[in-house]
């Protein structure tokens, strides 16, 4: 029940993570004008990874999109990148755990296959979330550079007596939505990793007694429907005690692990 | 088509409050900004306050913006300015404007005129 | 605050006359965002509420005749009308609409020379 709990609050911790990751990718709040110097502008210019836009006093509002490819800075470029990777990896790994949900019934389709399944998307999850993180994160190190260069040279006049003022930029919102969506798809990974864990079916989960017979050993193992002589390719006669604890130069087998439905 | 229309009294006693009223139509108000600007006598025009489109945000000449407010009435169309201590300096002509594309004022009133007298 | 100051002040001229009129302002009003300058130029007539005739210093106001063309960049604008005709006898005012307050120019009257 813990298991099917974890599973499904990962999944859906990562379904708004990369509808977050998604969002933000879109939104044109990049990097907003920085108001600082003058809070009362008629004209409010704002940034994002795909267009400029100016919002006028009088309501309008105005966006360009960079239709240039080669003339955006490499940086721009990068953040694109891997939100972009971000959003495919995410968008990968919520089609891969929706079949590799405990509670949904595909087929026959085997625990060991959910489990792995359930650890392909925990892992897609965390990079995506990695990437919109590390995307963000370049993004706003852009700013934070570019907005002390032009503070540097904020005023330069014509004989002291005209001023042009540059356009400062700061942390537009869409930032704070990826960084929130990027940790969310991270924690979301995380828990269906460890979801996978619960899922996958240890040794350790079952109390186990053998009894012997003449000549071999025949291990019946409560909740499970097959008994084995041994676990993989170990044939060793050896008495499972305490819920199955193991000698170190035992071989653990996984595919035998979950072998049983 | 687009009409903006100012009303108000015409004349003011010093230290009384003036309210004057912009009922526009043809427009809707969510779209443009709104400004009043004053020209006093042969003098130049003098931008006083302005209502953003979605009425957020407002804004005032510096020197005035203790005296002066300016809200809406979207039921009514209406734009309305009030300055309270009025006083002779205030006596000029009081034009509304609908505020566009590049900020610009691309539809004025017709302007009422206002004279502060004893 | 932007300052605006235009100049002439007064201008006479005759009809047909190439006309320029000059308006500087105090800050740059070009908008790095969008490359625009916010610059108004408006005509007004004794007892006649003003009429926008230019807006980002160079695009003309729908109805606006072609005689009327609006330039420069920056900090120093100009209005110039081709042609003047009878109609074009009024005051000009420029307007920065870059940042409020949302200063207007002096004022320059064309009158009949």
């Known amino acids: 029940m813990a298991v099917t709990a974890c599973q499904g609050l990962g999944f859906v911790v990562s379904l708004i993570g990369i509808a977050g990751i998604i969002a933000a990718t879109c939104m044109d709040q990049w990097s907003t004008q920085d108001l600082y110097n003058n809070p009362v502008t008629a004209v409010f210019n704002y940034q994002g990874l795909w267009r400029s836009c100016v919002r006028e006093s009088s309501g309008f509002t105005e966006c360009r999109g960079y239709f240039t490819l080669l003339g955006l800075p490499a940086m721009l470029q990068a953040v694109r990148a891997l939100m972009i990777v971000g959003i495919v990896l995410g968008a990968i790994g919520l089609l891969v755990s929706i079949f590799a949900l405990k509670c949904i019934r595909i087929g026959s389709m085997e625990d060991s296959a959910k489990a792995n399944m359930t650890l392909t998307s925990g892992i897609m999850f965390i990079v995506s979330g990695l990437c919109a993180i590390a995307g963000v994160s370049v993004f706003a190190n852009m700013l934070v550079t570019n907005f002390w260069m032009s503070t540097a040279n904020m005023y330069t006049g014509m004989g002291g007596m005209v001023q042009t003022v540059q356009t400062r930029y700061t942390f537009g919102a869409a930032l704070f939505v990826g960084w929130v969506a990027g940790g969310l798809t991270l924690i979301g990974g995380v828990m269906m990793c460890i979801a996978c864990r619960g899922l996958a079916p240890e040794e350790t989960n079952y109390k186990a007694v053998s009894y012997h017979a003449s000549g071999h050993s025949v291990a019946y193992k409560p909740g499970g429907f097959k008994a084995s002589t041994g676990f993989g390719s170990n044939t060793k006669n050896k008495k499972i005690y305490d819920g199955g604890a193991r000698t170190e130069d035992e071989v653990q087998s996984y595919p035998s692990k979950h072998d049983y439905v | 088509q687009v009409t903006l229309r100012e009303s108000g009294p015409a004349l003011v006693k010093p230290t009384q409050t003036l309210t004057l009223t912009c009922t526009f139509s043809?427009?809707?108000?969510?779209?443009?900004?709104m400004s009043w600007i004053r020209q006093p006598p042969g003098k130049a025009l003098e931008w006083l306050a302005t209502?953003?489109?979605?009425?957020?945000?407002?804004y005032y000449l510096d020197s005035l913006k203790d005296r002066f407010t300016i809200s809406r009435d979207i039921s009514k169309n209406q734009v309305v300015l009030t300055v309270t201590n009025m006083d002779p300096a205030d006596t000029a002509t009081y034009f509304c404007?609908?505020?566009?594309?590049?900020?610009?004022?691309?539809?004025w009133g017709q302007g009422t005129t206002v004279t502060v007298s004893s | 605050d932007i300052q605006m100051t235009q100049s002439p002040s007064t201008l006479s001229a005759s009809v047909g006359d190439r006309v320029t009129i000059t308006c500087k302002s105090s800050?740059?009003?070009?908008?790095?965002?969008?490359?625009?300058?916010?610059l108004t130029w408006y005509q007004q007539k004794p007892g006649k509420a003003p009429k926008l005739l230019i807006y980002?210093?160079?695009t003309r106001e729908s109805g606006v005749p072609s005689r009327f063309s609006g330039s420069g960049s920056g900090t120093e604008f100009t209005l110039t009308i081709s042609s003047l005709q009878p109609d074009d006898f009024a005051t000009y005012y420029c307007?920065?609409?870059?940042?409020?307050?949302?200063?207007f120019g002096g004022g320059t009257k064309v009158e009949i020379k």
């Open positions: 404007a609908r505020q566009s594309r590049g900020n610009a004022m691309d539809y």
């Open positions: 043809g427009f809707t108000f969510s779209s443009y900004g």
């Open positions: 209502i953003s489109g979605g009425g957020s945000y407002t």
């Open positions: 800050q740059s009003l070009l908008n790095s965002g969008n490359q625009k300058n916010y």
């Open positions: 980002w210093a160079s």
């Open positions: 307007q920065n609409d870059y940042s409020y307050p949302l200063t």
